[in-house]
Interface confidence: low
């Protein structure tokens, strides 16, 4: 499996592009839209029929250092009576995001882009029934 | 994660904070993730709060293709397969980091950008606003 490369050869390179050593790219980590404050609307993680909890993972050698992951609270879904219905399944919904990984090798520091799979929340689905012959 | 102890003789700059601009290897370390959610699972069809997936393409961004979820119904699908409007289908939204070409069209110069995407939908008990 090929590791994807970010640089695209089909772009016409303007004169104003900064010089970049071969095999690498220049990355400004001052985030565009950094101050867009986001909060999920009014605790949907508790109101969902497939509720979830959040945990924060912390890594000082990752940028951003804080990544929030969701975990479904139940295997089944919560019915109208507030009881778990195991004829339905709570399943995680996931989304890829990019992070920058800092690596120390001796006294030198290198940076690597990494795709991270974040579990965002959960949804309630009808299970796939596998009939055993 | 644990910070790797450094040789005491190393200069101590950039230990805690990341520098504003970094040179990064063009290869992305990815965890075998699948960028097409239609291929990776059929939750969008099987959910009690089903959603459609819309392709958002931008060649000035990496990844250039992002899939956006749009809930199909205001209510949720009940056991009979009908829409129950006593419940609400709502999108689950997430901020993700992408790369934006900066300056525009440059092949190997990027800036991180935070974008908000709807990843899927979940079925919730509605908040009832009582009008006085």
């Amino acid at each position: 499996r090929k590791i994807p490369k970010v640089g695209h050869t089909f772009f016409q390179k303007p004169e104003s592009c900064p010089p970049v050593p071969g095999g690498s790219m220049k990355l400004d980590i001052g985030i565009i839209n950094e101050n867009q404050r986001v909060s999920m609307s009014r605790n949907i993680e508790s109101r969902s029929t497939s509720p979830w909890n959040y945990t924060v993972t912390w890594d000082p050698n990752r940028y951003p250092s804080e990544v929030v992951q969701a975990q479904c609270r139940n295997l089944g879904c919560i019915n109208a009576q507030g009881k778990e219905d195991i004829s339905m399944n709570s399943v995680p919904i996931q989304q890829e995001t990019l992070v920058v990984r800092r690596k120390h090798q001796g006294c030198s520091v290198s940076f690597q882009l990494e795709k991270v799979l974040v579990t965002v929340g959960c949804t309630c689905v009808t299970p796939v029934i596998h009939h055993v012959q | 994660g644990i910070t790797i102890p450094r040789n005491p003789g190393c200069p101590n700059s950039e230990d805690k904070n990341f520098p504003r601009t970094v040179m990064v290897n063009l290869n992305i370390h990815n965890r075998n993730t699948n960028t097409n959610p239609k291929r990776s699972s059929d939750y969008y069809n099987r959910s009690t709060s089903p959603w459609n997936l819309h392709r958002n393409e931008d060649p000035e961004r990496y990844p250039s293709v992002i899939w956006e979820a749009k809930c199909r119904h205001l209510g949720c699908i009940n056991a009979d397969g009908n829409v129950d409007y006593h419940m609400n289908s709502v999108p689950i939204q997430q901020e993700i980091l992408v790369l934006r070409r900066e300056p525009p069209h440059c092949p190997n110069s990027f800036r991180l950008e935070k974008i908000l995407v709807s990843v899927g939908c979940t079925c919730v008990t509605p908040i009832v606003h009582h009008v006085a």
Epitope: R42 | L74, V90, Q93
Partner: nanobody, 124 residues
Framework: EVQLVESGGGLVQPGGSQRLSCTAS????????MGWYRQAPGKQRELVAL???????DYADSVKGRFTISRDNSKNTVYLQMNSLRAEDTAVYYC??????????????????WGQGTLVTVSS
């Protein structure tokens, strides 16, 4: 916050037509579905029609072929064109929308919002 304001209600003759409109206002980021519900005296609120951001629409069986829902995304407005009106269409018509919006620097993902309702009376 987000407000939904309906207009266009009133008294109509059986067989006549009426057009309702509903506009969403506030610091709106996206509207992924808008629609109309109605509540006749002594009855439960019921779906009339919904229109999704992609343009596809969903109608209650009782109004199919008579009512048409449309939306103008640039104006955050949804319309309900009601033709061949019957006495049983008499109800308070409520606008509903799923909206994402900013308020006080916080982003709220989509929730169901409701208008105050507009009365449509079909009578000779």
């Amino acid at each position: 916050e987000v407000q939904l304001v309906e207009s266009g209600g009133g008294l109509v003759q059986p067989g006549g037509s009426q057009r309702l409109s509903c506009t969403a206002s506030g610091t709106i980021v996206n509207i992924h579905v808008m629609g109309w519900y109605r509540q006749a005296p002594g009855k439960q609120r019921e779906l009339v029609a919904l229109i999704f951001s992609g343009g596809s629409a969903d109608y209650a069986d009782s109004v199919k072929g008579r009512f048409t829902i449309s939306r103008d995304n640039s104006k955050n407005t949804v319309y309900l064109q009601m033709n061949s009106l019957r006495a049983e269409d008499t109800a308070v018509y409520y606008c509903a929308a799923e909206i994402g919006y900013y308020s006080g620097g916080t982003y709220y993902s989509s929730e169901a919002h409701w208008g105050q309702g507009t009365l449509v009376t079909v009578s000779s």
